[in-house]
């Protein structure tokens, strides 16, 4: 079986992995090749190699291979994420179970059957032997660990520390002992990659000497791992295609778990009033197909002869003739009673996520494990294998792949706003998932409201009621406008991007809107030359409860001596108390003859329980709203003034630190006015901007 | 001019089959999720189902089933199949217009058409 | 299933009045994306309100729309003439589900 070629089957395949080593001591093999196949040959066979090759990188992009005498359960050596790299280490160095007598076992076991150290293969105390390293080269005669160089009866042994025991066998399992399974095994994933014949399996992303439709990419949740046993189809146990290209494929030998119980993460939430998923795991007495005609039973061959028995299928619960899913079907079904109509959908049973209680997230939701995967606009979440790449260009950490299955909404990026996925649509790369933060769960997100902990500063220099006119430094300011009128303002954050408020959109047709960018007169009088006329291409709103949206500009604006960005703080940053602010706008100033003038207000930070007594404890702030009291009586912001910016001065730089929304009141004397803290959703923000396309100036 | 207007109702018999088509003008289906919405005589609107931006197809419970929401962006054209119809399904049915891939995150019907009566009766 | 309860059903009162109309949903709304819409006999519905406090576009500031989680209000400051009409509420619900209230008949006093 174990030929020169197809080798690559000895080896466990981590995708987008490379070994880094720590250790400059160990040594490494490089050399240009064109597939890893080339790779796992060498590998296997140590030819021209200093040491035992014991795992193999292969770099996809420069076509090389990397040899390595260590793997990545090595000291001295860590694993690291990187797109061109696939990582192969050879089985039999990180199986902790045996096939057969254990002749390939190259595992760390080094205590024997009764509990006795081994003695190391190069030493000659306390037992003098002939099984030198040098003897048995191939057979890894390393350190103190149970070998079987011979391929004895026993299996896997060694000589023992023990002057009055010459040597014992190591109590080491057989793999198919270990390797257990529930059901028919179609959730088994196990590293069991050898048929019951002995014969080895098929690695699943090679077509040879088979080829076949179960390709990894094409069935990411199937578990299509190297070459081990699995049961993607449906059938009695685990399979695989075998090396024997004259077998073409054969059942594995893959025990039943003893007490035949499935992971909590692989059991399908069993059901009984509607339909969770697939409805895999329906258990309820519908038994009638959606037009109402009666089910054949499961245990019966009339009128339709079919496999489908409650003696193949054990874990299915294909009692009576209820409708089931025991085939991964798109929904629970059952053979008709009709000779003329074979089988049917039960699909009318509801669906769970309509007619139960909602889903819902605690924290940040980074813990949510349900299966809602739809964005809230509707789309169907892509798969996060798909996505890793994307996932990577704006996390510094490898995420928890165990979490990303299928394409379920998830958050393996610690945004502060929930779960969210990626989709399929170009122009909303991803978005949030119409899930909401539990009842009563008060978990902040961030902590410290009212103590400076993180500087909210890194960057520069807001309708205003009896404020006075400004011209200086206020080339961030957008009037947005509605069918040819000012109805908001705004902040340039980015060259393609204002932040504003919701409430300023009243129509959905983005031909409506136009972004003024230099003036000073809302009108637009005098400002001629420093104008700048945007349309609009893309509105993103913010996450649940915030208020506030992006808006994309059709064009990048050109920054000049009018026109400037405006920085974002650090996120979950705190502003001290008595920092001096400002609000900016062009709405209604309370003067009978308003001359359209940009309009500022000076305003002063206020902590969050400070500014709640101010409003007679009827308003409680939370982590996403900031406070600015007015120095001047009735000086704030009001209507028209609404998506413009509170800018805040800190180290000499001016920053956006809260977004103008309606429902506070408007300037009223004594009421400090409540923003939207932009530093609580300015990961948002980065996140929207990164990925986000944008048009290029 | 933007506007959705359907076609297709009828009277047809109980267990019978009905197509109902929702032709747009002035925008283009396949950017915007659209969803039926019907109105029993005398009664209160009731969501019946959308095909969302990608097509994605969600359905109420009692449409589950039954009812099959397509599109043909090529016709710019959304569609309702309904099949093994039954007299409480007799209403006037409105195709609306609902998310846009313009307005990340927004979820409200802005647009509606004139409707299209079916009634379903022996 | 999900319930949206609209309050009262009927109301009845003269033009200049104020007319408040409440919906309550037996679950969350996500993201507080509740909409208003007037009907008038024989025509279809037309927006009012979105996001439950924002003014649809040529919709008079009359009408303005409170609330947040699972209890909604709108509110038409002084009745005119032509808001006699029926007022539904709809909410939309994790899974992409949309729900409407029953309906408010706002008739003449």
């Known amino acids: 079986q174990r030929k020169r070629r197809n080798t690559i089957h000895e080896f466990k395949k981590s995708a987008k992995t490379t070994l880094i080593k720590i250790d400059p001591a160990l040594k490494i093999k490089t050399k240009k090749v064109n597939t890893a196949d080339q790779c796992a040959n060498r590998c296997t066979r140590n030819k021209g190699l200093p040491f035992t090759c014991k795992a193999f990188v292969f770099d996809k992009a420069r076509k090389q291979c990397l040899w390595f005498p260590f793997n990545s359960m090595s000291s001295g050596v860590k694993k690291e994420f990187g797109h061109e790299f696939d990582l192969y280490e050879n089985k039999d160095y990180i199986r902790n179970c045996i096939i057969g007598k254990g002749r390939s076992y190259k595992g760390t076991v080094s205590i024997t059957k009764s509990g006795i150290k081994c003695q190391p293969w190069s030493s000659m105390i306390p037992h003098e032997h002939s099984f030198l390293p040098s003897s048995y080269r191939g057979k890894d005669l390393q350190e103190n660990y149970c070998r079987n160089p011979r391929g004895e009866e026993g299996g896997p042994w060694c000589f023992t520390s023990n002057p009055e025991v010459r040597y014992e066998v190591c109590d080491i399992p057989q793999c198919s002992e270990v390797e257990c399974m529930t059901c028919n095994g179609e959730s088994y994933r196990g590293l069991m990659d050898h048929t019951e014949s002995g014969k080895i399996c098929q690695r699943w992303d090679h077509q040879t000497p088979h080829r076949h439709k179960f390709l990894p990419e094409r069935y990411p949740d199937k578990g299509f791992d190297d070459n081990y046993c699995r049961n993607p189809d449906g059938q009695p146990r685990p399979w695989c295609y075998t090396l024997d290209p004259h077998t073409r494929w054969e059942y594995c030998a893959i025990k039943t778990c003893a007490d035949n119980t499935m992971n909590d993460t692989d059991v399908p939430l069993e059901t009984t009033e509607c339909i969770q998923g697939q409805g895999e795991g329906y258990r309820g007495t519908v038994n009638t197909i959606w037009n109402g005609i009666p089910c054949q039973r499961w245990d019966s061959q009339y009128p339709h002869e079919h496999d489908m028995t409650p003696e193949n299928f054990k874990c299915k619960d294909l009692r009576e003739n209820y409708c089931r899913n025991p085939d991964g079907s798109e929904s629970p079904w059952c053979f008709t009673t009709d000779p003329n109509i074979r089988v049917g959908y039960c699909s009318q049973i509801p669906n769970c996520d309509m007619s139960h209680g909602q889903d819902c997230y605690r924290g940040n939701g980074k813990n949510y494990m349900g299966n809602l995967s739809q964005t809230r606009s509707g789309l169907t979440c892509s798969m996060w294998d798909k996505n890793m790449e994307d996932l990577h260009r704006h996390i510094f950490w490898e995420p928890d792949a165990s979490k990303l299955n299928e394409n379920y909404c998830r958050n393996p990026d610690d945004d502060a706003h929930g779960p969210w996925c990626y989709t399929g649509n170009p122009l909303i790369p991803w978005d949030y998932c119409p899930i909401s933060r539990c009842e009563g769960d008060t978990t902040p997100t961030i902590v410290n409201l009212d103590h400076p902990v993180i500087s909210c500063a890194k960057t520069k220099q807001l309708r205003v009621v009896n404020g006075i006119p400004t011209r200086t430094n206020i080339g961030w300011m957008v009037s947005l406008r509605y069918r040819n009128k000012h109805i908001c303002g705004g902040s340039l954050i980015k060259e393609s991007w204002v932040l504003t408020a919701r409430q300023c959109f009243p129509s959905r047709d983005l031909k409506d809107y136009e972004a003024w960018l230099g003036i000073h007169d809302v009108h637009g009088r005098g400002d001629e030359k420093c104008k700048q006329v945007l349309n609009v291409s893309q509105l993103v709103y913010g996450p649940e409860g915030s208020d506030l949206v992006l808006m994309k500009l059709a064009r990048p604006a050109v920054l000049d001596d009018f026109v400037s960005t405006i920085d974002l703080p650090n996120y979950g940053c705190t502003i001290p108390e008595k920092t001096s602010c400002s609000v900016y706008g062009w709405g209604y100033t309370g003067l009978i003859n308003y001359d359209g003038l940009l309009r500022v207000a000076h305003l002063y930070i206020m902590g969050n329980e400070k500014c709640s007594q101010h409003h007679r404890g009827k308003v409680t702030l939370n982590e996403s709203e900031i406070c600015a009291g007015a120095e001047k009586i009735g000086s704030g912001p009001c209507e028209g003034d609404y998506g413009g910016p509170l800018v805040c001065e800190q180290h000499k730089m001016r920053m956006v630190l809260g977004v103008i929304v309606p429902g506070r009141g408007c300037a009223i004397p004594n009421r400090p006015g409540i923003f939207v803290r932009v530093a609580y959703y300015a990961k948002w923000i980065h996140k929207i901007i990164l990925t986000y396309k944008v048009p290029q100036s | 001019e933007v506007q959705l207007v359907e076609s297709g109702g009828g009277l047809v018999q109980p267990g019978g089959s009905l197509r109902l088509s929702c032709a747009a003008s002035?925008?283009?289906?396949?950017?915007?999720?659209m969803s039926w919405v019907r109105q029993a005589p005398g009664k209160g609107l009731e969501w019946v189902g959308a095909?969302?931006?990608?097509?994605?197809?969600y359905y109420t419970n009692s449409a589950k089933g039954r009812f099959t929401i397509s599109r043909d962006n090529s016709k710019n054209t959304l569609y309702l199949q309904m099949n093994s119809l039954r007299a409480e399904d007799t209403a006037v049915y409105y195709c609306?217009?609902?998310?846009?891939?313009?307005?990340?995150?927004?979820?409200?019907?802005?647009?509606w058409g004139q409707g299209t009566l079916v009634t379903v009766s022996s | 299933d999900i319930q949206m309860t609209q309050s009262p059903s009927s109301v009845s009162a003269s033009v200049g009045d104020r007319v408040t109309i409440t919906c309550q949903s037996s679950q969350r709304i996500y993201s507080n994306w509740l909409s208003w819409y007037q009907q008038k006999p024989g025509k279809a519905p037309k927006l009012l309100i979105y996001a439950a406090s924002s003014l649809a576009s040529g919709v008079p500031s009359r009408f303005s729309g409170s609330g947040s989680g699972t209890d909604f209000t709108l509110t038409i400051s002084s009745l005119q003439p032509e808001d006699f009409a029926t007022y539904y509420c709809?909410?939309?619900?994790?899974?992409?589900?949309?729900?409407f209230g029953g309906g408010t008949k706002v008739e003449i006093k």
């Open positions: 709809a909410g939309y619900y994790s899974g992409h589900i949309y729900s």
């Open positions: 095909s969302s931006i990608d097509g994605t197809t």
């Open positions: 002035g925008f283009t289906v396949s950017s915007n999720g």
């Open positions: 609306a217009r609902g998310e846009y891939a313009g307005v990340v995150g927004s979820n409200y019907f802005d647009l």
